[in-house]
């Protein structure tokens, strides 16, 4: 805390300048009127303050408002949002995307921070759900953003919004993610034509059920080994070799270098070897002849 | 006067961490933000971390991003560079230098510690 | 990152000479720019700060100009004590990166 003393003669603050830098921390606390602090609040950031002054800056502004800054405020902070701790950002009440911006911007190029991650979550519980606007911002400045939900956040997000996601947004997501992202990703992109679909459907394939591969399977898409590798064991297990062959096209070749990493060696597990050997690239570990498949996983469901 | 001292350089394997520290001195350390700046040998400078005053906040260039950790401890006026899964490539000099605010240059320097990573 | 570029790498000058650097920014940094002077087995020494500032004890021949993406740093005299290397910074973005100096070395 910053001790009340007068301010001396002259010193009073007319505007917030960068006269103010050569301000001791105790004459910044008695001259510079908290409203005026306020209505100035862009001017800051174009001021070089030391990280003292920023925090007296601050306990003027806590002090003016002690139930949460008003978003006119807000939306000016600059690299004083920095100082915020995340107690100081749960009492606002942001409901701007221009706001938003504009605090992201602060951190922009860095990991997302604990001021940051509480800022987003104020905002998007605010707005009720993520909207295409925010998620298009939200990814815009953390590629990752979408993969720090939880299966329960990202329920809320609708089909419309799945358009503003790119690619690279999903790559760390897990697959309980994706589960729940490919459906709204398949009711989004219904109406495409088949190699648009696929183009744009193709990154959340990881949550994609056997059914949508075998009817993808039909439609020459040539998926790449990349993505191949990312889909759910479980939805590949039940892939005759002829469906995978048609589903990677040229691309098959490929399974050869995989054939010791999941899914491709669970799958391999489970075809027949007379039919790996039809795709010629040396596959091993298949069922070989004249032995029986039992379906324990069937058996178990009748009982 | 301000003064820094830096420490704890020396060769290390690759793979294996180190950490620095540097003493400072001659100035309320509390107030200021603190940074780690390197020069590879016959190399330019790299800018490697920020701290600000109260560790709030720290900034990484993204060629240590995950591996290496800035760190501050107010009460002995040091702060700490913990390098994790070394390379080649970070064989340098590492200076610890002094800022007073987002917006202002780095005023005072150490006199550097060299770590070298070699097998 | 914002980008910094320096040049030229390399400066052959003579003593009395006026000597010119440039920094060039791949965004605008306002005026949030740094020169710093380094001699070998030294640390680098503050020249400069907001673009054209000069650092308390920093003799008068040494000058900066610029704002938004080009800047200079100007040594007006040149004196046996300046041959060094010269870089530059930007401290508008948390990661203050430099340029990749410029050694001024005797003709």
């Known amino acids: 805390e910053v001790e009340k003393t007068a301010c001396p003669s002259g010193k009073k603050a007319r505007e917030i300048d960068e006269s103010l830098i050569f301000y001791k921390k105790w004459e910044l606390e008695a001259c510079v009127d908290a409203a005026l602090l306020a209505t100035q609040m862009d001017r800051v950031n174009a001021i070089p303050f030391t990280y003292e002054q920023l925090d007296v800056l601050k306990h003027k502004l806590d002090e003016l408002y002690p139930q949460g800054y008003p978003e006119s405020v807000i939306q000016h902070l600059g690299y004083l949002f920095l100082k915020m701790s995340p107690e100081d950002i749960r009492k606002w009440n942001v409901t701007s995307l221009e706001t938003l911006k504009a605090l992201l911007e602060v951190n922009k190029g860095h990991e997302m921070s604990p001021q940051v991650a509480t800022l987003i979550d104020r905002f998007v519980k605010g707005r009720g759900q993520l909207d295409k606007d925010t998620l298009d911002t939200l990814t815009a400045f953390y590629p990752g953003y979408l993969c720090s939900l939880s299966p329960e956040e990202l329920s809320s997000v609708p089909p419309s919004s799945i358009w503003a996601v790119r690619p690279q947004d999903l790559d760390t997501c897990d697959p309980r993610q994706l589960d729940v992202l490919y459906p709204k990703a398949r009711l989004a992109f219904q109406n495409m034509n088949g190699s648009e679909y696929f183009v744009k459907i193709q990154s959340f394939l990881g949550g994609a059920p056997t059914e949508d591969l075998k009817a993808l399977s039909q439609q020459n898409v040539s998926m790449d080994l990349a993505t191949f590798m990312k889909l759910r064991t479980d939805a590949v297990l039940p892939l005759t070799v002829a469906e995978v062959q048609k589903l990677l096209g040229p691309h098959v070749e490929g399974l050869k270098a995989e054939e010791r990493h999941r899914p491709v060696r669970d799958w391999i597990l489970r075809q027949r070897q007379d039919d790996l050997d039809t795709l010629g690239l040396g596959l091993q570990g298949g069922i070989p002849n004249g032995y029986l498949v039992l379906d324990l996983s069937m058996q178990e469901a009748l009982s | 006067q301000v003064q820094l001292v830096e420490s704890g350089g020396g060769v290390v394997q690759p793979g294996r961490s180190l950490r620095l520290s540097c003493a400072a001195s001659?100035?309320?350390?509390?107030?200021?933000?603190m940074n780690w700046v390197r020069q590879a040998p016959g190399k330019g400078l790299e800018w490697v971390a920020v701290i600000w005053n109260d560790g709030s906040n720290k900034y990484y260039a993204d060629s240590v991003k995950g591996r290496f950790t800035i760190s501050r401890d107010n009460s002995k006026n040091t702060l700490y560079l913990q390098m994790n899964s070394l390379r080649a490539e970070d064989t340098a000099v590492y200076y610890c230098?002094?800022?007073?605010?987002?917006?202002?240059?780095?005023?005072?320097w150490g006199q550097g510690t060299l770590v070298t990573v070699s097998s | 990152d914002i980008q910094m570029t320096q040049s030229p790498s390399t400066l052959s000058a003579s003593v009395g000479d006026r000597v010119t650097i440039t920094c060039r920014a791949s965004q605008s940094i306002s005026r949030w720019l740094a020169w710093y002077q380094q001699k070998p087995g030294k640390a680098p020494k503050l020249l400069i700060y907001?673009?054209?500032s000069l650092e308390s004890g920093v003799p008068s021949r040494f000058s900066g100009s610029g704002s938004g993406t080009e800047f200079t740093l100007t040594i007006s005299n040149l004196q046996p004590d300046d041959f060094a290397t010269f870089y530059c910074q930007q401290y508008q973005s948390y990661s203050r990166t430099f340029g990749q100096g410029t050694k001024v070395e005797i003709k």
């Open positions: 907001k673009a054209s």
């Open positions: 001659g100035f309320t350390f509390s107030s200021d933000g």
């Open positions: 230098a002094r800022d007073r605010g987002p917006l202002w240059p780095l005023d005072y």
